[in-house]
Structure formats: structure tokens, C-alpha cells
């Protein structure tokens, strides 16, 4: 694609190339043959994050505590506010407009990946040899107890929800 009539950081208006406003500033008036583009800084709680010809700055995102949100990074004149969720909650979307409680892994399932402010808990079924007997957002599948290492024998087989039950070995009379 060949270059356009105006260079980078310029825009074409009424047969002339005007300078775009830098990030953090909005357009007040286009340039003319005799005057430069006029730009003004964005106000408090406003931003523009690109070279632009916008006549209005965007409002910073509001991290609504009623939706479980809190400020992760305060916005500047060039960046939007970044919201995240309160402890124990995570965002429902990439834009993080609301939060939901972290999911717990049911008995028989363990935590594969602990939830973050932006992603939910990932559970996995406990494979043979492992179990989880609680509903938890943190607990992994635990390995069955090894009876042999305790000089005991398996009295009751383990499941994905229960540990094995060990007991003493039958003594030869």
C-alpha cells in the first residue's frame, strides 16, 4: 500500500495536512494554511491513548466496588484506569466490567490452576492414586497414603474422593 498524502502523525483535512494531537490531548481546532493544529490536555479523570483528532477525551473507567471491582492501576491522561477484582473474585470478561466469586473444585476434583483477578479456578479430576475430599478453591488432589512405607497394609481402597485406609499387617501365628 503506497503512503497517503499526509505523513505519520498527520491527518488530511480540507486539502492540507494537519498535525495530530499527541496522546493525552484533544483537538480544539484543525490547522489552517496559517495556523497550527490546536490541542488541549485532557481533564482530570479523562484520557486519550493515541495520536488523535478527537474533540472529546474518553472518561476513565470506574472500578465499581458494588461489582467487586477495585483499581489495579490508576489512569493517567494517556492511559485508562485498569480494574481488577477483590480477593477471592475474578473478572467476568477481558474488559473486567464485573466480578464473580472464584469457583471451588468439588470432592473428586483438585485445583489445577489457582484463580487470579482475571481468571477462574481450573479444576481437574483426581487421577487414580490421588483424591480430594473437600470443596476448595486452593486444594490440589492429594496422593493416597502409602501404607507400605508405614509398614501397614491397605484395608480399604482409596477413591478419587477418599484416601486409602491402612491397617496393621496380619501377624503369622
Amino acid at each position: 500500500e503506497p503512503p497517503t498524502a499526509c505523513r505519520e502523525k498527520q491527518y488530511l483535512i480540507n486539502s492540507q495536512c494537519c498535525s495530530l494531537c499527541q496522546p493525552g490531548q484533544k483537538l480544539v481546532s484543525d490547522c489552517t494554511e496559517f495556523t497550527e493544529t490546536e490541542c488541549l490536555p485532557c481533564g482530570e479523570s479523562e484520557f486519550l491513548d493515541t495520536w488523535n483528532r478527537e474533540t472529546h477525551c474518553h472518561q476513565h473507567k470506574y472500578c465499581d466496588p458494588n461489582l467487586g471491582l477495585r483499581v489495579q492501576q490508576k489512569g493517567t491522561s494517556e492511559t485508562d484506569t485498569i480494574c481488577t477484582c477483590e480477593e477471592g473474585w475474578h473478572c467476568t470478561s477481558e474488559a473486567c466490567e464485573s466480578c464473580v466469586l472464584h469457583r471451588s473444585c468439588s470432592p473428586g476434583f483438585g485445583v489445577k490452576q489457582i484463580a487470579t483477578g482475571v481468571s477462574d479456578t481450573i479444576c481437574e479430576p483426581c487421577p487414580v492414586g490421588f483424591f480430594s475430599n473437600v470443596s476448595s478453591a486452593f486444594e490440589k488432589c492429594h496422593p493416597w497414603t502409602s501404607c507400605e512405607t508405614k509398614d501397614l497394609v491397605v484395608q480399604q481402597a482409596g477413591t478419587n474422593k477418599t484416601d486409602v485406609v491402612c491397617g496393621p499387617q496380619d501377624r503369622l501365628r
Partner: antibody, heavy 116, light 107 residues
Amino acid sequence: EVQLVQSGAEVKKPGESVKISCKASGYGFTNYLIEWVRQMPGKGLEWIGVINPGYGGVNYNEKFKGQATLSADKSISTAYLQLSSLKASDTAVYFCARGGSGFAFWGQGTLVTVSS
Amino acid sequence: EIVMTQSPATLSVSPGERATLSCRASQDISNHLNWYQQKPGQAVRLLISSTSRLHSGIPARFSGSGSGTEYTLTISSLQSEDFAVYFCQQGNTLPWTFGQGTKVEIK
């Protein structure tokens, strides 16, 4: 005094090409855009495209993309409009104009007649 | 593309009278509206740029006004040399587009 002087009238056959020139004087050639406009007989004005003579950047009207090619030679302060695959319906007066808050100064126009 | 509509197509006025020409855009053009005069055998002439800015060398009897989609060219007292065709043109959004023209003729 700003002046745009265009090349003379052309008569072409269908399928041929034509290259019109527009020589600028009286101002800094690379400081302003050059616009090109078509006026068919008895009709209004139609924008073809614009070129920045400083570095050759162009914008075309979609309608003329592929048929019109704009260029400029800084060393002789001259802009060019080339039209290819001419048809009878391309018969028109073609104008160049200097930009800067509208089409500030115009050439006298070049009549291109396409006839078999 | 933005469609520019001029009215009337022809305006019959006596010398010394006021002439009012209208130009409507199909969408807001933010005052990027220019007026041109065309006479047979002469180069097209820019009269007014950006709605109301008189181009150098243009007599003060020409004035422009308007905003949004509605624009007006006024010639306060027509002189013999003002009988011509007048075009409006928007410079807000590519492709640049022109009105179909208003012919101002002697009444």
C-alpha cells in the same frame, strides 16, 4: 503570484493513455498538496485524487483507483496525472489545484478528448 | 461518500441585488465547506474556505455562513462580473465532494 500552468489539449483513441502536467510557480512546491479534479462536458466537478509533492504520498477517489496515477517531480515543480485505458466517457476537462484550506489556486484545465 | 446538494440550480438576479446560495451536506462536515466560482474560459476561483474565511483578493461582498450540514454563500450586491456558476465543496471527509453547482444569471 501563485500559478498552475497545465499542458495543452489532448486527443486520444479508446484504450490509450494520457499524461497531463501541472507546473507550479510562485510558492514552495513541496509545502502544499496538489489536487486533481475532472469536469465532464456540461457537468459538475469530480475529485480524482491528491498528492503530496514533498514525498509522493497519494490518496485516490475509489472511482478512479486503477485508472488514474498521480506523480510529481520536485526538481521542476511539476505534478502529473496519468489516465490509462481511456474510454469515450473519459472525455473531460482535467484540473489541478493547489491545496491549503480548500483548493486555493487552480490550473486553467486540460481538455482530453477520447474518440475513435 | 458525503453528498453535497446545492439550491437553487439557477438563480435569476438583477445587478445590485442580494443573492443567497444554499448548500446542504448529507452529514455534518464540521465547517469544512468551501465555495468556488467558475466562469467560461477562466480558471476556477476559490471564494471562501472553511465556511466563512474570505480568500485573498476576493471582494467583501462575498460572505459565507453555516454549520453542521447547512451552508450559505451570500453576495450582498451583485456586480456584472459575479454572474457565473458557483460550486460548494466539502473538505471534511475523503473523497472530497462537490455540489452540482448554482448558476447565477442576469434577471
